[in-house]
Each structure stands twice: as structure tokens, then as C-alpha cells.
């Protein structure tokens, strides 16, 4: 199920790559974050918290990725024209519960002036 | 139906402390993380904090630290708040509120019908 | 703290009049939900992400907004309507509320 497309701007462009950012709600103390190319898991992050309040990161399909309290950033690089997709955010909430699933996402646009290594 | 049945009143002593209880029916406990919240005439409404009862992780409002205390009994299906040192300014109504999540934040979806404490000497 | 100012303070309509409240956020939000309140019960949840009417609630109502400015309107004012309206924003640490329309019937 598709819950929306994000409300926020999930894709930043810089020397030729992308930021794409997956926003969760700072609460939020344990979720896994899958980015969805398509139907396709590009990459995964999964955030838990241990006795002790000790935090976990695992990767099982590891990207380039960046953690805040309150989004994950992925990051992709070498952009080409087979880039363009739509790309969702999928977040399973673990805790504080519910257990809650959301699929946000937007269709990413390639221009000549993204792309990494232009042809002159 | 879905229900959080809170204790009742209080009339408490300046520096005394009071332990406020929020018990819930109709749902699986363990599968929902509580809120609790203060209203008073001053302030409107106030976020104090909440507690996961599936991990006991606790949240506090800065504001809130080391005046409120929650914990939770998962046998009873009871959520606790302890408040400590209480003045005047700790009168008001203390709700417990359930957590859920929309499409992009969370929410209180179900209230309790609150608990008037009145710190008097 | 991201403080909610809610305008007006109180206000009253006439049956069949169309009502709008603001809520105002010192910092941007991503959403924000709308509680109501009547005299001595506990709030309800009324409107949630921004524009989503909670079960139960009449589809006269209506959340919208984004950024730092939010309302919620109300087609044609019934009597059943009257209460205090609270925002919520949930989505920066404290989270607050705002402090409430008193919405009365003429």
C-alpha cells in the first residue's frame, strides 16, 4: 500500500549524485528503512535499541547512508539516465509502538545538468 | 470498545507526591505506547512525555524531568505516572493519551477521561 | 520550543456559517493534527497529518496547511460543533500544543 508521496523534498542533487531522504517521525526509537527503487530494495537500514539504551545500526543492503533523530539520508552516485524511477521510502515502526508500516515516495527526474560525467 | 480508565481525583499536600494510574481495555496493551499530557488553566494543554510498553524506552518533555515518573505494570494493562515535589502549579487535569501513527507523524488517538490533582495545604 | 498560536482566541458563528481557525507555528512543521474539546470531557482526536478527519467526525470539517501555517474549517457551523479546538505538532521535540479557539454558536 502506498501511503502517499512524500510532503517533504526527498530528492537533493550535488556533483552528480543524489541525496534521497526518508523521513520518520523523531519518536521514533527503533524502525527499519528500506529504499525502494520500483519494487526493488536498493538499500536498508535498520535502527534498534539495546539494554542500556545502546544503539544498533545494521545494513543488510548497504548504501551510503546518513542517520538523524528525525530522517535517513541514502545516497546514489554516478547518476545516469536509468536513475529515473519512482523511488519510495518504506518505514517499519518498531518502537514506540504500534507496529506501523509507510511507503512515501516520488518520482525521480534525471536532467543533463544532474547527470555525473556529461558528455561536452 | 477501546478504553483508558484513569484513577481518581487527588488532593495532595505541597512536597508530597502522587502516583496517577491509566489502565487499558479493548486492545492489546503491550501494542501501543502511552502518552501523558497536563492541562491547566496557565498552560492549555502540555505534552509530559511517554512510555513504550514494549521496550519500558521512556520520552520526557525537558520540562517534566525529574517532576514525572512513568512506568507501566503489563500484567494489569496499567500505565503509572509518579509526580514528585508537588506545588500549585502541579494542579490540573493529567490525561493518558495512546499512541498512533498517521502516514507521516503520531497522534493521541484515544484519550482517558483524566485525573484532577489539586495540591492544597 | 515551537510555539502554536491559535487565532482567533474565541470566535462565534451562525448556524450555516463557514468557519476557519488558524494555527500558527514559530518553526515549520510536517503535519499537524486538530483535537476537540468540550466542556469538562478529555479532548478527541479530530483531524490528524494536517487533513485526515479521525472516525467518526462530520465531513464539514476540514484540516488544511503546511509550513508554519495550518487551519481547520468547518462548511456550514451546526450546534454541536461548539468546543475548543486545540493544533498539535508532533513532529519537533517538545511537542506542543496550541492554546485553543473557542468556537460558540450565535
Known amino acids: 500500500e502506498i501511503n502517499g508521496s512524500a510532503n517533504y523534498e526527498m530528492f537533493i542533487f550535488h556533483n552528480g549524485g543524489v541525496q534521497i531522504l526518508c523521513k520518520y517521525p523523531d519518536i521514533v526509537q527503533q524502525f527499519k528503512m528500506q529504499l525502494l527503487k520500483g519494487g526493488q530494495i536498493l538499500c536498508d537500514l535498520t535502527k534498534t535499541k539495546g539494554s542500556g539504551n545502546t544503539v544498533s545500526i545494521k545494513s543488510l543492503k548497504f548504501c551510503h547512508s546518513q542517520l538523524s533523530n528525525n530522517s535517513v539520508s541514502f545516497f546514489l552516485y554516478n547518476l545516469d539516465r536509468s536513475h529515473a524511477n519512482y523511488y519510495f521510502c518504506n518505514l517499519s515502526i518498531f518502537d514506540p509502538p504500534p507496529f506501523k508500516v509507510t511507503l512515501t515516495g516520488g518520482y525521480l527526474h534525471i536532467y543533463e545538468s544532474q547527470l555525473c560525467c556529461q558528455l561536452k | 470498545q477501546v478504553q483508558l480508565q484513569q484513577s481518581g481525583p487527588e488532593l495532595v499536600r505541597p512536597g508530597e507526591s502522587v502516583k496517577i494510574s491509566c489502565m487499558g481495555s479493548?486492545?492489546?496493551?503491550?501494542?501501543?505506547?502511552m502518552h501523558w499530557v497536563k492541562q491547566s488553566h496557565a498552560k492549555s494543554l502540555e505534552w509530559i512525555g511517554l512510555i513504550s510498553i514494549y521496550s519500558d524506552h521512556t520520552n520526557y518533555n525537558q520540562k517534566f524531568q525529574g517532576k514525572a515518573t512513568m512506568t507501566v505494570d503489563k500484567s494489569s494493562s496499567t500505565a503509572y505516572m509518579e509526580l514528585a515535589r508537588l506545588t500549585s502549579e502541579d494542579s490540573a487535569i493529567y490525561y493518558c493519551?495512546?499512541?498512533?501513527?498517521?502516514?507521516?507523524?503520531?497522534?493521541?488517538?484515544?484519550w482517558g477521561a483524566g485525573t484532577t490533582v489539586t495540591v492544597s495545604s | 520550543e515551537n510555539v502554536l498560536t491559535q487565532s482567533p482566541a474565541i470566535m462565534s458563528a451562525s448556524p450555516g456559517e463557514k468557519v476557519t481557525m488558524t494555527c500558527s507555528a514559530s518553526?515549520?512543521?510536517?503535519?499537524m493534527h486538530w483535537y476537540q474539546q468540550k466542556s469538562i470531557t478529555s479532548p478527541k482526536l479530530w483531524i490528524y497529518d494536517t487533513s485526515k478527519l479521525a472516525s467518526g467526525v462530520p465531513g464539514r470539517f476540514s484540516g488544511s496547511g503546511s509550513g508554519n501555517s495550518y487551519s481547520l474549517t468547518i462548511s456550514s457551523m451546526e450546534a454541536e460543533d461548539v468546543a475548543t479546538y486545540y493544533c498539535f505538532q508532533g513532529s519537533g521535540y517538545p511537542y506542543t500544543f496550541g492554546g485553543g479557539t473557542k468556537l460558540e454558536i450565535k
Open positions: 479493548g486492545y492489546t496493551f503491550t501494542d501501543y505506547a
Open positions: 493519551g495512546r499512541n498512533n501513527y498517521g502516514n507521516y507523524g503520531w497522534y493521541f488517538d484515544v
Open positions: 518553526s515549520s512543521v510536517s503535519y
